[in-house]
């Protein structure tokens, strides 16, 4: 099967968590707009996560667009510096854990849990389907394994997970062995397969956080949510690699695919902006 | 006890605006998401808007967005509500509530009169 | 949006009876975590509304548990046992899994 065709490199401390927006939008399409200047600017995209030159028309456009370099990093990246990931023996809660609920961008809100650092218990929020931040979860369960102190006052097993060969689905275990793989990927490859509301049966494909795997579903036409790829190969590229192996030491190894990198082709238009 | 006690309300014009408070007590504000809910004159009840714990985030009824801006101010126990550019339909009583742990509201206050009229 | 259907809009009771509201969704609301986010609220007149039950029948602490509530998917029911004099206002239901929340027109409990 090509999907286990993988190499292992390092990772690196480069490497960003997923996308977190300072300004919603940072989030949209660049836009050269309707007129016809050549003037060089910049725009955040959400897929590099880097600011990039693109060539403005000199009218309309939107307010992802920028003079200069500085100018856009200022508005659009925040310092990723700090590292994320702990490793394997450490006891403490990951720093995602004390991070606000963020509902993100979208609208396709669903129930989704986060760690509040005030009650020290997992609640419930409602998320809105893309970009927001890694305190959020799709089962209390895993919250309360990633960030709720155990009975004895220390972390049970942050990231454990068994593979239930009755449902094929992962569940949380409760141990102290070192886990096997983190999710450390863009965001929406967390959120479920959303057909969206028109009435089209196109041939889609979604990654399944939870077995880890692309999976077709039929699409409507529009609407959704970002966790739609046209081929089996552009989902495992997108999503596949934001999986973290970890290796017995407590180093880490990314699964990375050999193929040569393609970006992700994801209509904007249907992300739904809120004013923030 | 839980007591929230909401102020600010009062007459406006359409299109004026107005400024809703929530104080809190009887429990760590800073811990819990908040929203605003109205009840028209004789009518239902109608979620308007939900912040989340540090706030941060945001969430709005359509009716509302755009015009209304929910915020808090954690160290001051309190929760508000701008309203602008208002219309006759957003007469009622407004009552702030707290989210609980599922995301619910749990706690709710008594409630401060808003009227739109000319 | 999720609409919510209380029947009937008004319930007059006699003191002792017992009453039941019931309430229809227009989607289901069991949640993807498997809970179902439906709830029930109690205005007494020219009060502020008061959370009875949560979680479909989770009666909150200080409710006297003649109330209850039952349902799933998308039909419930609030019953209270033996209606008080205390009881009388407008309940409504109200659903938490889906955004917006939204809620029922409320049903007005009034003694004969």
């Known amino acids: 099967d090509s999907e286990e065709d993988e190499e292992h490199t390092i990772i690196t401390d480069t490497e960003l968590p997923p996308l977190k927006l300072m300004h919603s939008f940072c989030a949209f399409k660049a836009d050269d707009g309707p007129c016809k200047a050549i003037m060089k600017r910049f725009f955040f995209n959400i897929f590099t996560r880097q600011c990039e030159e693109f060539i403005y028309g000199g009218c309309e456009g939107n307010q992802n667009r920028f003079e200069s370099l500085e100018e856009c990093k200022k508005m659009c990246t925040r310092d990723n510096a700090n590292r994320i990931i702990k490793t394997t023996l450490q006891q403490e809660k990951p720093d995602f854990c004390f991070l606000e609920e963020d509902p993100g961008i979208c609208r396709g809100y669903i129930t989704r849990y986060f760690y509040n650092n005030q009650t020290k218990q997992c609640e419930r929020f409602k998320y809105g389907g893309c970009l927001g931040n890694m305190n959020n979860f799709e089962t209390l369960e895993e919250c309360k394994n990633i960030c709720e102190d155990g009975p004895n006052g220390f972390q049970v097993d942050n990231y454990g997970t068994q593979l239930n060969a009755v449902n094929n689905s992962l569940t949380p275990q409760s141990t102290k062995v070192p886990s096997l793989f983190e999710f450390h990927g863009p965001s929406w490859c967390l959120t479920p397969a959303d057909r969206g509301l028109c009435r089209a049966n196109e041939n889609r494909f979604y990654y399944n956080s939870v077995i880890g795997k692309c999976r077709p579903f039929k699409y409507s036409g529009c609407g959704g949510n970002e966790n739609n790829f046209t081929s089996k190969q552009e989902c495992l590229r997108a999503c596949k690699k934001g999986f973290i192996q970890r290796i017995s030491k407590g180093g880490l190894i990314k699964t990375k695919r050999k193929r040569k990198k393609q970006r992700v082709k994801i209509a904007y238009e249907e992300i739904f902006v809120k004013n923030m | 006890e839980v007591q929230l006690v909401e102020s600010g309300g009062g007459l406006v014009k359409p299109g004026g605006s107005l400024r809703l408070s929530c104080a809190a007590s009887?429990?760590?504000?800073?811990?819990?998401?908040m929203s605003w809910v109205r009840q028209a004159p004789g009518k239902g009840l109608e979620w308007v808007s939900t912040?989340?714990?540090?706030?941060?985030?945001?969430y709005y009824a359509d009716s509302v967005d755009g015009r209304f801006t929910i915020s808090r101010d954690n160290a001051k126990n309190s929760l508000y509500l701008q309203m602008n550019s208002l219309r006759a339909e957003d007469t009622a009583v407004y009552y702030c509530?707290?989210?609980?742990?599922?995301?619910?509201?749990?706690?709710w206050g008594q409630g401060t009169l808003v009227t739109v009229s000319s | 949006d999720v609409v919510m259907t209380q029947t009937p809009l008004s319930l007059p009771v006699t003191l002792g009876q017992p009453a039941s509201i019931s309430c229809k969704s227009s989607?289901?609301?069991?949640?993807?975590?498997?809970?179902?986010?439906l709830n029930w609220l109690q205005q007494r007149p020219g009060q502020s509304p008061k959370r009875l039950i949560y979680?479909?029948?989770k009666l909150d602490s200080g409710v006297p548990d003649r109330f209850t509530g039952s349902g799933s998917g998308t039909d419930f029911t609030l019953k209270i046992s033996r209606v008080e004099a205390e009881d009388v206002g407008v309940y409504y239901c109200?659903?938490?899994?889906?955004?917006?929340?939204?809620f029922g027109q409320g049903t007005k409990v009034e003694i004969k």
């Open positions: 109200w659903q938490g899994t889906h955004f917006p929340f939204t």
């Open positions: 989607q289901s609301l069991l949640d993807l975590d498997g809970k179902t986010y």
């Open positions: 509530a707290r989210q609980d742990g599922n995301f619910l509201m749990d706690y």
């Open positions: 912040i989340t714990t540090g706030g941060s985030y945001t």
């Open positions: 009887g429990f760590t504000f800073s811990s819990y998401a």
């Open positions: 979680l479909v029948s």
